[in-house]
């Protein structure tokens, strides 16, 4: 990810931060989607008055996108064709492949609380399987 040249376009979580951290992150949890389709990854930080300065979306340790309070969205160039910002602080993944199966994290950088992290597990299914609503749960 070439950090020096960002492309900014306008405008069940855990906290790792301060001793007064009261916030919680609600996520879409474990979800499945059809190969070739799209999915919305959503997190919501609640129960805190902390100021959200930035939200990072990561897949494992790979940065997908950033939503910065001052600058808006930046999408990693390697995901530009398949990742769309929003809705809200969420992220839309398009043209899904089975390789997109895995863990996704929303990382909320807040003040004064610190960092809150939410986890989503996405399973991308072959079309015929997805049509029959097959799902699995992470224990």
């Amino acid at each position: 990810y070439p950090y020096d040249v960002p492309d900014y376009a306008g405008g069940g979580g855990s906290g790792g931060g301060g001793s007064m951290m009261t916030g919680t992150i609600e996520t879409t949890g474990n979800i499945s989607a059809e190969k070739g389709g799209s999915i919305i990854l959503q997190c919501h930080l609640s129960s805190t008055t902390a100021q959200v300065t930035q939200v990072n979306w990561e897949q494992q340790d790979q940065l997908l996108a950033i939503c910065n309070a001052d600058l808006g969205w930046a999408i990693s160039p390697s995901f530009k064709d398949r990742v769309a910002p929003g809705p809200g602080l969420g992220l839309t993944l398009q043209s899904l492949t089975v390789n997109d199966t895995g863990e996704y994290f929303c990382i909320y950088h807040t003040y004064p609380d610190g960092t809150y992290t939410g986890r989503i597990f996405l399973e991308v299914l072959e079309s015929s399987v997805a049509e029959h609503g097959a799902r699995f749960q992470i224990p």
């Epitope: 950090y3 900014y8 600058l71």
Partner: antibody
């Protein structure tokens, strides 16, 4: 090449004021949050203040809150630290540092400017 | 504030040695720890962030590990240019805090 150059340091009496500047080049300054970090002679590093890219978020260490003011002028690619009511314990080398875009750590630092508070 | 404790405060080693520096946080900081190298009269240089991610341009002999409260910086084969002071720093919450430093000297 990313460059950060601090200036404005010097000798000042206790209770006095000083304004530090940091001139940035080699990157899009207006896209990055910036920090001031200081280091007293022979001591470790101490975070002082942070300002986000558009100045909407500003944070200070408790030791300087109410006395120091961080600001920036994106049109001039410059970062500032206005230091008032200076104390002997503020004596240090002051570094400006760039925040990584992902908000994880400070990836480029200036060479520092020395501030000495003494009568 | 989160206290960061580094150990040892100094160590002597030879070129080619494997060097390990540890950093302990007073409470969990998840993976959000950075390591910096500082040489006398110079500015700190970022080596590692988020516990284990190598900053661009940093030699691969440097590695970081750990999460929660306990972290380690390892230099697999010490080179002459590695003699310096190393600082850990938590970037999980404000105020960002640094460890006291570990000075790596020539034996």
């Amino acid at each position: 090449e990313v460059q950060l150059v601090e200036s404005g340091g010097g000798l000042v009496q206790p209770g006095g004021s000083l304004r530090l500047s940091c001139a940035a080049s080699g990157f899009t300054f207006s896209n990055f949050g910036m920090h001031w970090v200081r280091q007293a002679p022979g001591k470790g590093l101490e975070w002082v203040a942070f300002i986000s890219s558009g100045s909407s978020s500003i944070y200070y260490a408790d030791t300087v809150k109410g006395r120091f003011t961080i600001s920036r002028d994106n049109a001039k690619n410059s970062l500032y630290l206005q230091m008032n009511s200076l104390r002997a314990e503020d004596t240090a080398v002051y570094y400006c540092a760039r925040m990584r875009l992902d908000y994880y750590a400070m990836d480029y630092w200036g060479q520092g400017t020395m501030v000495t508070v003494s009568s | 504030d989160i206290q960061m404790t580094q150990s040892p405060s100094s160590l002597s080693a030879s070129v080619g040695d494997r060097v390990t520096i540890t950093c302990r946080a007073s409470k969990s900081i998840s993976k959000y720890l950075a390591w910096y190298q500082q040489k006398p009269g110079k500015a700190p240089k970022l080596l590692i962030y988020s516990g284990s991610t190598l900053q661009s341009g940093v030699p691969s002999r440097f590695s970081g590990s750990g999460s929660g409260t306990d972290f380690t910086l390892t230099i697999s084969s010490l080179q002459p240019e590695d003699f310096a002071t190393y600082y850990c720093q938590q970037h999980n919450e404000y105020p960002w805090t640094f460890g006291g430093g570990t000075k790596v000297e020539i034996k």
